[in-house]
């Protein structure tokens, strides 16, 4: 279960994500700075520093809109 | 050719200080989480600290917590850690690595490692 | 901290053997689970990550298999070059464990 303000790291934190986020899917960046591969976003805010589940949410995919 | 490589190593006396360099090329160096990881003599692998891409945020093993830090400079492409309060139980080969943080935390290169000697 | 295991922690082969190496991990770590290659004197070098994905430039006959606690590293067809220490390594949560390692020797 998920531990609020803690730090989440490795495998973890992707279960974490994938559990928070649902269908949704995650970015490991926000989608305003790109999705990118690179070692920032989620894993600094997240493993490095503590990440509660307001924090989590943010890297959620929103889904697409339906016409 | 993707590279990494250490210095620094040496002997020294119990209690002192050591400060290890590993001087990364062929990789956008500062896009990766950085790790130090080592080997005492005829033993095992151990992880010992880790640092974000940025350089703002660290992660260390509890047997060198206070220790030990671990600090890079992306403008020069190098990842260091400072070893201070040095004890016999350090001896090892230090080895610097690059982490392949999504793709399942792997190291996926390695340096050629450093020998430290700490004895009296 | 996850404890991790490995069996067997020597184990002699010939050239051309099926050999079987099991980690184990003290809780469930779905698949976050890496092998490395050690030869005397160098550096570890990754064969899989993620349980079972082979690394860029790693031979065929290495596979990996196994998720939760349990994991296999195979070696399908053991050549002169295979001979050395294999570690496993948990990718699930700081600090990232490693296993006490698996000589494997020429018989």
């Known amino acids: 279960a998920y531990r609020p303000s803690e730090t989440l790291c490795g495998g973890e934190l992707v279960d974490t994500l994938q559990f928070v986020c649902g269908d949704r899917g995650f970015y490991f960046s926000r989608p305003a700075s790109r999705v990118s591969r690179r070692s920032r976003g989620i894993v600094e805010e997240c493993c490095f520093r503590s990440c509660d589940l307001a924090l989590l949410e943010t890297y959620c995919a929103t889904p697409a809109k339906s016409e | 050719e993707v590279q990494l490589l250490e210095s620094g190593g040496g002997l020294v006396q119990p209690g002192g200080s050591l400060r290890l360099s590993c001087a990364a090329s062929?990789?956008?160096?500062?896009?990766?989480?950085m790790a130090w990881v080592r080997q005492a003599p005829g033993k095992g692998l151990e992880w010992v600290s880790s640092i974000v891409s940025s350089g703002g945020y660290t992660k260390y093993a509890d047997s060198v917590k206070g220790r030990f830090t671990i600090s890079r400079d992306n403008s020069k492409n190098t990842l260091y850690l400072q070893m201070n309060s040095l004890r016999a139980e350090d001896t090892a080969v230090y080895y610097c690595a690059k982490d392949m943080t999504y793709s399942g935390d792997a190291f996926d290169v390695w340096g050629q490692g450093t020998m430290v000697t700490v004895s009296s | 901290d996850i404890q991790m295991t490995q069996s067997p922690s020597s184990l002699s082969a010939s050239v051309g053997d099926r050999v079987t190496i099991t980690c184990r991990a003290s809780q469930s770590i779905n698949t976050y689970l890496n092998w490395y290659q050690q030869k005397p004197g160098k550096a570890p070098k990754v064969l899989i990550h993620?349980?079972?994905t082979l690394e860029s430039g790693v031979p065929s006959r290495f596979s990996g298999s196994g998720s939760a606690t349990e994991f296999t590293l195979t070696i399908s067809s053991l050549q002169p070059e295979d001979f050395a220490t294999f570690y496993c390594q948990q990718s699930y949560s700081v600090p990232f464990t490693f296993g006490p390692g698996t000589r494997l020797s020429s018989k």
């Open positions: 993620a349980a079972s």
């Open positions: 062929g990789f956008t160096f500062s896009e990766y989480v």
